[in-house]
Amino acid sequence: TQHGIRLPLRSGLGGAPLGLRLPRETDEEPEEPGRRGSFVEMVDNLRGKSGQGYYVEMTVGSPPQTLNILVDTGSSNFAVGAAPHPFLHRYYQRQLSSTYRDLRKGVYVPYTQGKWEGELGTDLVSIPHGPNVTVRANIAAITESDKFFINGSNWEGILGLAYAEIARPDDSLEPFFDSLVKQTHVPNLFSLQLCGAGFPLNQSEVLASVGGSMIIGGIDHSLYTGSLWYTPIRREWYYEVIIVRVEINGQDLKMDCKEYNYDKSIVDSGTTNLRLPKKVFEAAVKSIKAASSTEKFPDGFWLGEQLVCWQAGTTPWNIFPVISLYLMGEVTNQSFRITILPQQYLRPVEDVATSQDDCYKFAISQSSTGTVMGAVIMEGFYVVFDRARKRIGFAVSACHVHDEFRTAAVEGPFVTLDMEDCGYNIPQTDESTLMT
């Protein structure tokens, strides 16, 4: 988890399509009751935007204190501001909660740039626009932080939805979702629809805008089109998956697929960009530049630093290629692909553009910690985190931004051999995953 690149903004071996469709597990057979269908009360419960994160309203303590909490599938702590901070409108006041219990233990979470630290405790937590339950959960009360909270982001804490293995200070601290599933009848699954605006939002528009949906305990069919395709969760720490092939406008990058997953590939709602390992990033940018070679953009644009602006409404989406990631399927030797548009990987930037201009940052960047499928990817898709069956599902999001010529896609099956070889085995050490 890289502060400075992660939010809080701290921004293969593919084959030809099969003639006949391989069997795949979609969402026809519910595992638990109430797991599928309509979750009206949870639809549209997220706000925010990709550059500053998506947040859900939660209540903590007795009487309930309402806070906006960043939804982060790339970490595993529930941590909230618990002391005054210039960027916080409100914070958790433990002394006002009759149900707060102090664990008499500290927690320190350093990032590449910045950090937060706090005191551990438990309290009663609920999600007003979520399941109608209250759980006692571990809470890190953030008492000190550096470059963690974002001015104007409108959130006051972070909900780490990944697994206990990466919880701080150690894996004995039960993450919120584990507590929720243990203490209630909520199925062990959640799904996210992050809706990128496709255009810059000013502060008042963000506060008024709908950012998407977090469906806790199920799948809402109204949030996606087509079929859900599932990829196995390789290991339960981050939401780790395996990418087996990458294409730019249908052209295979032709790299050893291990490179795509070096040293891991994760699905992370708390990261803005699609982040790629150095070699993969360089090959991808070279290919994207070649595909859009009728134009020449400044070096700083490809580094995600400079903005490119076009007169409002004239952004030449057609000159930019689509990007396809092939993911390991659930069936042996079968993969599927998810395809994003430039509308996802060119991120609209507020404040800079005039009413005459639409300005964008290139939202694909280099990583030293593996591939991170951040908001740039997730905004194209409805993503199902099916923890019960150790898999992640992708379908085309009903809210993704596209044009009249191209749309994001989830397609399959494709024959792909030796996919297990695409995974990288990280040498087992005790080093901090947050410090890499």
Partner: antibody, heavy 120, light 108 residues
């Protein structure tokens, strides 16, 4: 070394079209590393970016002038040109052509400039 | 739109003195800022790009600093040929169309 030289009439009548050409010598206009741009400076005033072109013909214009500006490139002659239609006295300025280098961001090489007066 | 404000409008100094010119952006432009020098009757010349990098052939007495919104061009010891107008330009937003209004450095 590479040089830029503007050429064209020094006097244009109101409502007519101003036409200027920039000739690139000592290097190729077809280099993929550069854009080629036009900037103007009214007498005693500051610099105003007009627009620029890539050898492929891709153009970028200042929105305030866009409806009147056309920039084109002739790679066979190693030249690029500016046309500004429906001119008025406010278009009187020294017109510079320049190369956009240093990571396609900064005007790292300029022509000497040519004064164009709009008057009847 | 990002606006660049240069100050002072005029700086009256003697040869050998130190000149400090300011350029302030209405919002952050990171380090994507350039400085140009223009002598009377001549075209502008690139002095500094990337806020602090000297362009080819520019003497060491010229230095640039700053990032975000506040930038400074310093001429450590003015030579007679340094009396000119200096412009800043931001290219954080591209295409590179925004110049400051200029600072005239004149002989006192």
């Amino acid at each position: 070394q590479l040089q830029l030289q503007e050429s064209g009439p020094g006097l244009v009548k109101p409502s007519e079209t101003l036409s200027l050409t920039c000739t690139v010598s000592g290097g190729s206009i077809s280099s993929s590393s550069y854009y080629w741009g036009w900037i103007r400076q009214p007498p005693g005033k500051g610099l105003e970016w007009i627009g620029m072109i890539y050898y492929s013909g891709s153009t970028w214009y200042n929105p305030s002038l866009k409806s009147r500006v056309t920039i084109s490139v002739d790679t066979s002659k190693n030249q690029f040109s500016l046309k500004l239609s429906s001119v008025t006295a406010a278009d009187t300025a020294v017109y510079y052509c320049a190369r956009v280098g240093h990571g396609v961001s900064y005007f790292d090489l300029w022509g000497r400039g040519t004064l164009v007066t709009v008057s009847s | 739109e990002i606006v660049l404000t240069q100050s002072p409008a005029t700086l009256s100094l003697s040869p050998g003195e130190r000149a400090t010119l300011s350029c302030r952006a209405s919002q952050s432009v990171s380090s994507y800022l350039a400085w140009y020098q223009q002598k009377p009757g001549q075209a502008p010349r690139l002095l500094i790009y990337g806020a602090s990098k000297r362009a080819t052939g520019i003497p060491a007495r010229f230095s640039g600093s700053g990032s975000g919104t506040d930038f400074t061009l310093t001429i450590s010891s003015l030579e007679p040929e340094d009396f000119a107008v200096y412009y800043c330009q931001q290219v954080y937003t591209w295409p590179p169309r925004t110049f400051g209004g200029g600072t005239k450095v004149e002989i006192k």
